[in-house]
Interface confidence: medium
């Protein structure tokens, strides 16, 4: 099944994915007894419902939320499947086959959190997060129906030419890979704090001093390749006096459509 | 309702140690990521720390890193503070928190805010 | 760490008084900073994150402003049950912070 589940919106009381499913949640919805999507559906469902027994995607699902939407239907093209909505957005049902993918978005207003819907995916037992970082939109309380954005993704990589790999950097509850992550996270905050970034996932290291991967996710049309790694590269004093991080061999690259990620071991918030 | 229930608050002596229970009732406990909070008597709220939904990821403040283990068991909905060697600027009121989710990105404590509060309980450090 | 300046530290307004509460953070936070309420004897309360999005029933007579390093919290209409500690607290930075607080009592 791809079509979507609506759901109205406001509070409550279990607004999660179900255990093992790879969907984080939408916040603050009203009604509805019980509208996942069948298992295996990508279907993106809304969140954070007020009279709603359970209204999580079931088990396998990888339906990313909706958030604080007002009200949009029809058709989207772009980098990836996202769109998003009054600065919220909402993913729709992917298709390998075409860049434009059919969406269709519960009508509702609310005042609850505007956020990215997530494309991590697990990769092993010990990395089945569907991690956060906050984009840097805020809600728009308008009840109108607005244009949609796409979203454009970028794959980064670099060296951390200053420390060195080892088995730590492969297990995600080790101190050094988690303060390693969170450093990491906080840098690219500082770096691309201005217009149009939504955030980053899917962290990994790799050997060779450490090499760091990772997918950035920006508004469409707000940055491009060559941007990305321009406002990179001018952070890397500051990344070496602020997180002694001697970065070097940084590359970008747009995310071919559609986007299938690979989950690092980042943890939602 | 969502809600947390706390308990094990209690006086101890410094240099003892004490372990609080936030029960978690009401929303998907395993599902998020649980922050504990604490407020000195007559003071502000200061941060003390947060354990990922699966209990993988957890960071501290710098106050209490080393001595406090945050932990959770999600089979019964339940958070834990174990505080060891406690000091006397360890007494205050703690409360557990539910973050509210943020969804693209990594790293657990970049958080939207802190939407479900336990009451707090009461940790005492006095010889 | 980014250190949190509430002002002013205690606020003496009448019911139906507009209060405005200012925190100022030592360096930029960008918009990641969230407003809480806290009663006596009670935990505290989201009211605001993300610098001005109003959390799940929250009333709109609070609403939040401001970006990088000086923010508003305003209370259009005092309420009887409106006076209250408010903190102010921000994720931009390692580690999460909050400010001092500010009193806001009745006139």
């Known amino acids: 099944s791809t079509a979507p589940p609506a759901h109205g919106v406001t509070s409550a009381p279990d607004t999660r994915p179900a255990p093992g499913s790879t969907a984080p949640p939408a916040h603050g919805v009203t009604s509805a007894p019980d509208t996942r999507p069948a298992p295996g559906s990508t279907a993106p469902p809304a969140h954070g419902v007020t009279s709603a027994p359970d209204n999580r995607p079931a088990l396998g699902s990888t339906a990313p939320p909706v958030h604080n939407v007002t009200s949009a239907s029809g058709s989207a093209s772009g980098s990836a499947s996202t769109l998003v909505h009054n600065g919220t957005s909402a993913r729709a049902t992917t298709t390998p086959a075409s860049k434009s993918t059919p969406f269709s978005i519960p009508s509702h207003h609310s005042d609850t959190p505007t956020t990215l819907a997530s494309h991590s995916t697990k990769t092993d037992a010990s990395s089945t997060h569907h991690s956060s970082v906050p984009p840097l939109t805020s809600s728009n309380h308008s009840t109108s129906p607005q244009l949609s954005t796409g979203v454009s993704f970028f794959f980064l990589s670099f060296h951390i030419s200053n420390l060195q790999f080892n088995s730590s950097l492969e297990d995600p509850s080790t101190d050094y890979y988690q303060e390693l992550q969170r450093d990491i996270s906080e840098m690219f905050l500082q770096i691309y704090k201005q217009g149009g970034f939504l955030g980053l996932s899917n962290i990994k290291f790799r050997p060779g001093s450490v090499v760091v991967q990772l997918t950035l996710a920006f508004r469409e049309g707000t940055i491009n390749v060559h941007d990305v790694e321009t406002q990179f590269n001018q952070y890397k004093t500051e990344a070496a006096s602020r997180y002694n991080l001697t970065i070097s061999d940084v590359s970008v690259s747009d995310v071919p459509f559609p986007f299938s990620a690979q989950s690092g071991a980042g943890v939602p918030g | 309702q969502v809600q947390l229930v706390q308990s094990g608050g209690g006086v101890v002596q410094p240099g003892r140690s004490l372990r609080l229970s936030c029960a978690a009732s009401?929303?998907?406990?395993?599902?998020?990521?649980m922050h504990w909070v604490r407020q000195a008597p007559g003071k502000g709220l200061e941060w003390v720390a947060v354990?990922?939904?699966?209990?993988?990821?957890?960071y501290y403040a710098d106050s209490v890193k080393g001595r406090f283990t945050i932990s959770r068991d999600n089979s019964k909905n339940t958070l834990y503070l174990q505080m060891n060697s406690l000091r006397a600027e360890d007494s205050a009121v703690y409360y557990c928190?539910?973050?509210?989710?943020?969804?693209?990105?990594?790293?657990?404590?970049?958080?939207?805010?802190?939407?479900?509060w336990g009451q707090g309980t009461t940790a005492t450090v006095s010889s | 760490e980014i250190v949190l300046t509430q002002s002013p530290a205690t606020l003496s307004l009448s019911p139906g008084e507009r209060a405005t509460l200012s925190c100022r953070a030592s360096?930029?936070?960008?918009?990641?900073l969230a407003w809480y309420q806290q009663k006596p004897g009670q935990a505290p309360r989201l009211l605001i994150y993300d610098a001005s999005n109003r959390a799940t029933g929250i009333p709109a007579r609070f609403s939040g402003s401001g970006s990088g390093t000086d923010f508003t919290l305003t209370i259009s209409s005092l309420e009887p049950e409106d006076f209250a500690v408010y903190y102010c607290?921000?994720?931009?930075?390692?580690?999460?912070?909050f400010g001092q607080g500010t009193k806001v009592e009745i006139k």
């Open positions: 928190a539910r973050a509210l989710p943020t969804i693209f990105g990594v790293v657990m404590y970049f958080y939207y805010g802190l939407d479900v």
């Open positions: 360096q930029s936070v960008s918009s990641y």
């Open positions: 354990i990922s939904d699966d209990g993988i990821n957890k």
């Open positions: 607290q921000q994720r931009s930075n390692w580690p999460p912070t």
């Open positions: 009401g929303f998907t406990f395993s599902s998020y990521a």
